[in-house]
Interface confidence: medium
Amino acid sequence: KSPIFGPQEVSSIEGDSVSITCYYPDTSVNRHTRKYWCRQGASGMCTTLISSNGYLSKEYSGRANLINFPENNTFVINIEQLTQDDTGSYKCGLGTSNRGLSFDVSLEVSQVPELPSDTHVYTKDIGRNVTIECPFKRENAPSKKSLCKKTNQSCELVIDSTEKVNPSYIGRAKLFMKGTDLTVFYVNISHLTHNDAGLYICQAGEGPSADKKNVDLQVLAPEPELLYKDLRSSVTFECDLGREVANEAKYLCRMNKETCDVIINTLGKRDPDFEGRILITPKDDNGRFSVLITGLRKEDAGHYQCGAHSSGLPQEGWPIQTWQLFVNEESTIPNRRSVVKGVTGGSVAIACPYNPKESSSLKYWCRWEGDGNGHCPVLVGTQAQVQEEYEGRLALFDQPGNGTYTVILNQLTTEDAGFYWCLTNGDSRWRTTIELQVAEATREPNLEVTPQNATAVLGETFTVSCHYPCKFYSQEKYWCKWSNKGCHILPSHDEGARQSSVSCDQSSQLVSMTLNPVSKEDEGWYWCGVKQGQTYGETTAIYIAVEERTRGSSHVNPTDANARAKVALEEEVVDSSISEKENKAIPNPGPFANEREIQNVGDQAQENRASGDAGSADGQSRSSSSKHHHHHH
């Protein structure tokens, strides 16, 4: 399928001009290669009319140009002084020949309808309203005013000043005058449909002295706005329907042959295909709202329509806005797993992609909630503190420069199952959605900490050990101290690393962390985890309480921990005042200040796929073949 996209059908009238925009994928080659516009003949040949190399055909001389906009990945063909001879089939495309990548465009030029010379033309979109201005002479001020619609042989009354109204205009037509001006009356017709199109006559007075004015009302289906988006990226439909429908229910639907199937509305309806990846956000009191869809799929391409009606469903005669969405399969957004599986008590590490050109952007992780219009409260961010209910079990690790940041969630429960979004305050296309599935654990966890009831005594030495299976032998083990700004990695000692790499004794694989001397600030959550380079794997968490020594007793660490960790000389002492490297939290988490919600996401986040490296079906992380370096972490 060609990745070039443009308008399928372009229509205009004789003498007017058109502007045709064609989109191409964001690559250096595409930005610099030849762009062309050609006309398709009966033989299948496509004859160039204009190209970015400077070619201009005789028939377009003086009335057409082609402009490339590499920063937008678009080029535009402008054609003026259209005639019905311009009606035909065309291609816009890229390449050195006209057989390159292209998109078919049908251009249709209609004749201008013949109208009486003094006709005033009003052009309106379906569902909108029109106010027709009808001037008259002062002597006709006391006379009857009326508006009628011309049919072939007669003029059918729409409304008059004696309050007569045609049944098909009841509740839609109003005849009025403004202030003290006695030389003009107005007729307003609302909820316009195609049926309202045609010729009208305003009249004041009767007989030869009557004032008459011809009016031509054109009611058009709005031209669809073109949206060119990458596979797995996100799209925002910005819908502006006007103040008159501000209080009506809003909807977004997708055209399906004769009908428009509602995808989401403000009354709570949502298509299951969009579960976890859609939000509808009322913008203001002027009838504006937006719909955000992340994780675009091939099948999302198509014709969309937004509108407003009390039913939350499409209704004739109500304003609409339309889009044609093209999903480019040559996506720059990496293909990641969209479902991550974890087990109760276990952990998941979710790799969130972001635009590598924006490594300094603020990173966020939010949980999609489908109630109401859908919203996504931020749970953690590079400058957003972890939400209280996730204390000790959620952290974001930013790895500047490599296009990925990692979110780790441990102590999983079935309540954690659901949809989550990775997003930044930068390139909104890189908004990704992952579904977290949590199954009941059927076996012991891979990582176990001893002692399990960890209480350290002030001023003494305290050691905790993390046991790991042989399959993690070659991976890097770490301990980190959790705070609501992240998890700060601490020096630790890997017992297993000293063994021969040929055999692996399951009982002696452990990584220890020592606090010496214990201070009150050491109280809190600690994580033990494994990672391979910048790829984070499983974690487990433990809360260490700190208490004062009770009189007449000395505190002893549980023997099972010390039995495996009698390497005091080799263990590194952790100074409890280690400075934390993370960004300090700020009260306002960037663009999502309101209740930390990604509600008005408009166009500032994107897409959905995740690679939960620690989250395969059985809770294991990816194995690694890299050599383990024998040193203290």
Partner: nanobody, 125 residues
Framework: EVQLVESGGGLVQAGDSLRLSCAAS??????????MAWFRQAPGKEREFVAS????????DYADSVKGRFTVTRDNAKNTVTLRMNSLKPDDTAVYYC????????????????WGQGTQVTVSS
Amino acid sequence: EVQLVESGGGLVQAGDSLRLSCAASGRTLSFDTYAMAWFRQAPGKEREFVASIDYNGGSTDYADSVKGRFTVTRDNAKNTVTLRMNSLKPDDTAVYYCASARYYRSGTSFPVNYWGQGTQVTVSS
């Protein structure tokens, strides 16, 4: 380009019925973006509007002379538009043309951009 082909014309008696069909083909990217209409031209007269139908069939319009006797319908799945003519009169004798437009407009102001070749309807008394 769009090709419009009419069919169904013929010779009938006054009071009879006839059904004209118009099939759209060629590069019709989506038939439902065209408003459709029927016009007719009697010998020695100008072409006149008969009936029109909007994109999805929601709105129709008729010349006063055929109101109540003629019905226009469309089937977007089949790219066809039909004119059902009942109680035919000798005055209905003409060549009937199918037409399409990008804008739906009622009556004579229907802005045609494609015409069919026409089909002859003759009503004898």
